[in-house]
């Protein structure tokens, strides 16, 4: 027996109750591919979600977040509250970044300032809650008579202490 359902286009479903006839998706539902046995319920953009694209018989609705929130997850599956720069979202709401950390966005977590000395550099501009530190040249590079052509110090093998 040939499966007539494969002939049903997007926007329809294959109605088993009516000899595999292709019936249009009812209101508030869609099928984005052909040969479907059911239309799916359209996503509804309610509450903190707002509609970016209306549902049609062949494609699902797409949501964004209302002002003051931002999308998280695939296809904006969740909306998370925005915080100010210099803050992060906790279970108790937006909290200022602790000293030594920063967040330059309205979302995400506070991250530690860059440790300039790890790269042998000095702090050129101090960090704030909203901005990372700016690292400058190493102190040695700033000393009088330092040449930009100074060859790098030889790397020592791991596990060997200097003689």
């Amino acid at each position: 027996l040939q499966d007539l359902c494969s002939n049903c286009p997007a926007g329809t479903f294959c109605d088993n109750n009516r000899s595999q006839i292709c019936s249009p998706c009812p209101p508030n539902s869609f099928s984005s591919a052909g040969g479907q046995r059911t239309c799916d319920i359209c996503r509804q953009c309610k509450g903190v979600f707002k509609t970016r694209k209306e549902c049609s018989s062949t494609s699902n609705a797409e949501c964004d977040c209302i002002s003051g929130y931002h999308c998280l997850g695939a296809e904006c599956s969740m909306c998370e509250q925005d915080c100010k720069q210099g803050q992060e979202l906790t279970k108790k709401g937006c909290k200022d970044c602790c000293f030594g950390t920063f967040n330059d966005q309205k979302r995400g977590i506070c991250r530690p300032w860059t440790n300039c000395s790890l790269d042998g550099k000095s702090v050129l501009v101090n960090g704030t809650k909203e901005r990372d530190v700016v690292c400058g040249p190493s102190p040695a590079d700033l000393s009088p008579g330092a040449s930009s052509a100074t060859p790098p110090a030889p790397a020592r093998e791991p596990g060997h202490s200097p003689q």
């Epitope: 088993n16 508030n28 479907q36 059911t38 799916d40």
Partner: antibody, heavy 121, light 106 residues
Framework: QVQLQQSGAELARPGASVKMSCKAS????????MHWLKQRPGQGLEWIGY????????NYNQKFTDKATLTADKSSSTAYMQLSSLTSEDSAVYYC??????????????WGTGTTVTVSS | QIVLSQSPTILSASPGEKVTMTCRAS?????IHWYQQKPGSSPKAWIS???NLASGVPARFSGSGSGTSYSLTISRVEAEDAATYYC?????????FGSGTKLEIK
């Protein structure tokens, strides 16, 4: 005959997660959507959401978007629901129920046996 | 979301009596489904799309209605009809159920 056999009762601590199953038999699993419903003792029914096993598409009652995760395994004709961050409010009987997609009237024609979840410290 | 209000909450009837329970929607819906649930059991499909009896449901049951007002009628109640009856809609997401009418047999 068409049957939906659900996994056994679960006892869980607050904050924990549980994953229950609903094994379908007697029909073509991918031709129907699978819905999940909640019933608290002595109360009515609440729709949690559904999965279309054919495509994996899910649609949730917004009340349960952060609580429930629905999945399905076509090879074993089994639907699953995971509930996370459990509280006493989640203590209930949970049903899976089949909906005949081809009628598109979203009517639950076959119901599972129910899984009782008890959340207690 | 659409709220379904069922009345009465409890309905007491004698065998052979005719009973009617109603389901009112807060907004107009296209159709209503009905389910029967007995204590300790899963709900059962009872009436679909307002008036279609599910397989195995006795002919003494009937359903009717449109818009915001729907009803389930039993022409001659029998002892085995004692149960809670729920109405359900999906004209608007999410699916919602009424709080149920409990039918008691005297």
């Amino acid at each position: 005959q068409v049957q939906l056999q659900q996994s056994g009762a679960e006892l869980a601590r607050p904050g924990a997660s549980v994953k229950m199953s609903c094994k379908a038999s007697g029909y073509t699993f991918t031709f129907y959507t699978m819905h999940w419903l909640k019933q608290r003792p002595g109360q009515g029914l609440e729709w949690i959401g559904y999965i279309n096993p054919s495509s994996g598409y899910t649609n949730y009652n917004q009340k349960f978007t952060d609580k429930a995760t629905l999945t399905a395994d076509k090879s074993s004709s089994t639907a699953y629901m995971q509930l996370s961050s459990l509280t006493s409010e989640d203590s209930a009987v949970y049903y899976c129920a089949r909906s005949d997609g081809s009628s598109s009237k979203w009517y639950f024609d076959v119901w599972g046996t129910g899984t009782t979840v008890t959340v207690s410290s | 979301q659409i709220v379904l209000s069922q009345s009465p909450t409890i309905l007491s009837a004698s065998p052979g009596e005719k009973v009617t329970m109603t389901c009112r929607a807060s907004s107009s819906v296209s159709y209503i489904h009905w389910y029967q649930q007995k204590p300790g059991s899963s709900p059962k499909a009872w009436i679909s799309a307002t008036s279609n009896l599910a397989s195995g449901v006795p002919a003494r049951f009937s359903g009717s209605g449109s818009g915001t007002s729907y009803s389930l009628t039993i022409s001659r109640v029998e002892a085995e009809d004692a149960a809670t009856y729920y109405c359900q809609q999906w004209s608007s997401n999410p699916f919602t159920f009424g709080s149920g009418t409990k039918l008691e047999i005297k």
